[in-house]
Interface confidence: low
């Protein structure tokens, strides 16, 4: 016997209460693909989480994160603070990066300062908080009557929104 | 949120190979963003990070064998002169300290 | 060079049963606990579980426990599914950008 509940559309589920009748999805639920016995309830974006893109009833409600907080994960599944480029979130809040090392976001953790030594070159540009050094050529490139590097334009500043 | 890759193809060996990283639903340029191959029937291998302001990192077999540039909309892998033993699925991945989204994966085969 | 070696290639237990995966670095990751890990299952991509060592991440379910620091690392998964049949990927990261994946643990439910 062919199963009714597959000429259900997007929208709607399949009610076995009314003989396999198609019912619209009832409000602040979804679905998304035909065929469904129940409706989904509708993602709700509250607290450090804001609305995207509303709920239909054929697609889940999509959120971002309030200003001071940046997604995490395939969905915007979870909201993690902001720092300023220069620090680290830690256990116990935003704190400042240690001399020799850099973040250039306001997420992640800061990271040593590359080694231009290990590679044979020689320090452009001093690193900061914020900033990897630039390495540029090495000492025996820069003796007299060698071309002179041209420094590199400067790096361009990531996005200052946090998505 | 999303990311796709692009670009993968059979290529001979030798000829460059450029691929590309896009990402929906939120801005790539905020992001570190790293790629990731797979051989067939294989585990995960690194290749490389780029940070958000442009600087690349390599791992170190990856060195001269691959360049990682980006865009303010794309991240690019371009895989410089391949050979068989580059025949893989390529990932690109979201994020420094754990990759929480990654696209789907772009087939690159390389064969004469 | 770093190296991440997960000693076994594959483990089974039955449903409702308990597996460990261990993961150990031959130098110390950054921070100490600059490790994640990651499932795949065949045809898909790596979904990430863990990071900083230990760490949940959003929407894993808390049968995944990651626990560890420095160079010995262990990912611990209870009351298995049979959707937990996967393979399970440590990666470590090391100064300088290092990053590293070990090898992979196949996941057998019974």
């Known amino acids: 016997l062919q199963d009714l509940c597959s000429n259900c559309p997007a929208g709607t589920f399949c009610d076995n209460n009314r003989s396999q009748i198609c019912s619209p999805c009832p409000p602040n639920s979804f679905s998304s693909a035909g065929g469904q016995r129940t409706c989904d309830i509708c993602r709700q974006c509250k607290g450090v989480f804001k609305t995207r893109k509303e709920c239909s009833s054929t697609s889940n409600a999509e959120c971002d994160c309030i200003s001071g907080y940046h997604c995490l994960g395939a969905e915007c599944s979870m909201c993690e603070q902001d720092c300023k480029q220069g620090q680290e979130l830690t256990k116990k809040g935003c704190k400042d990066c240690c001399f020799g090392t850099f973040n250039d976001q306001k997420r992640g953790i800061c990271r040593p300062w590359t080694n231009c030594s290990l590679d044979g070159k020689s320090v452009l540009v001093n690193g900061t908080k914020e900033r990897d050094v630039v390495c540029g050529p090495s000492p025996a490139d820069l003796s007299p009557g060698a071309s002179s590097a041209t420094p590199p334009a400067p790096a361009r500043e990531p996005g200052h929104s946090p998505q | 949120q999303s990311l796709e890759e692009s670009g993968g193809r059979l290529v001979t060996p030798g000829t460059p190979l450029t691929l590309t990283c896009t990402a929906s639903?939120?801005?790539?340029?905020?992001?570190?963003m790293n790629w990731v191959r797979q051989a067939p029937g294989k585990g995960l291998e690194y290749i490389g990070i780029i940070s958000s302001s442009g600087s690349a990192y390599y791992a170190s077999w990856a060195k001269g064998r691959f360049t990682i540039s980006r865009t303010s909309t794309t991240v690019d892998l371009r895989i410089t002169s391949p050979t068989t033993e580059d025949t893989a699925t390529y990932f690109c991945?979201?994020?420094?300290?754990?990759?929480?989204?990654w696209g789907q994966g772009t087939l690159v085969t390389v064969s004469s | 060079a770093q190296v991440l070696t997960q000693t076994a290639s594959s483990v089974s237990a039955p449903v409702g049963g308990t597996v460990t995966i261990s993961c150990q670095s031959s130098?110390?990751?950054?921070?100490?606990?600059?490790l994640s890990w990651y499932q795949q299952k065949p045809g898909q991509r790596p979904k990430l579980l863990i990071y900083?060592?230990?760490t949940l991440a959003f929407g894993v379910p808390s049968r995944f426990k990651g626990s560890g620091s420095g160079t010995e690392f262990t990912l611990t998964i209870s009351d298995l599914e049979c959707d937990d049949a996967a393979t399970y990927f440590c990666?470590?990261?090391?100064?300088?950008?290092?990053?590293?994946f070990g090898g992979g643990t196949e996941v057998e439910v019974k």
């Open positions: 990666q470590g990261g090391y100064s300088g950008w290092i990053y590293v």
């Open positions: 900083y060592a230990s």
């Open positions: 130098q110390t990751v950054y921070n100490n606990n600059l």
């Open positions: 991945a979201r994020g420094d300290y754990g990759m929480d989204l």
């Open positions: 639903g939120f801005s790539l340029s905020n992001y570190y």
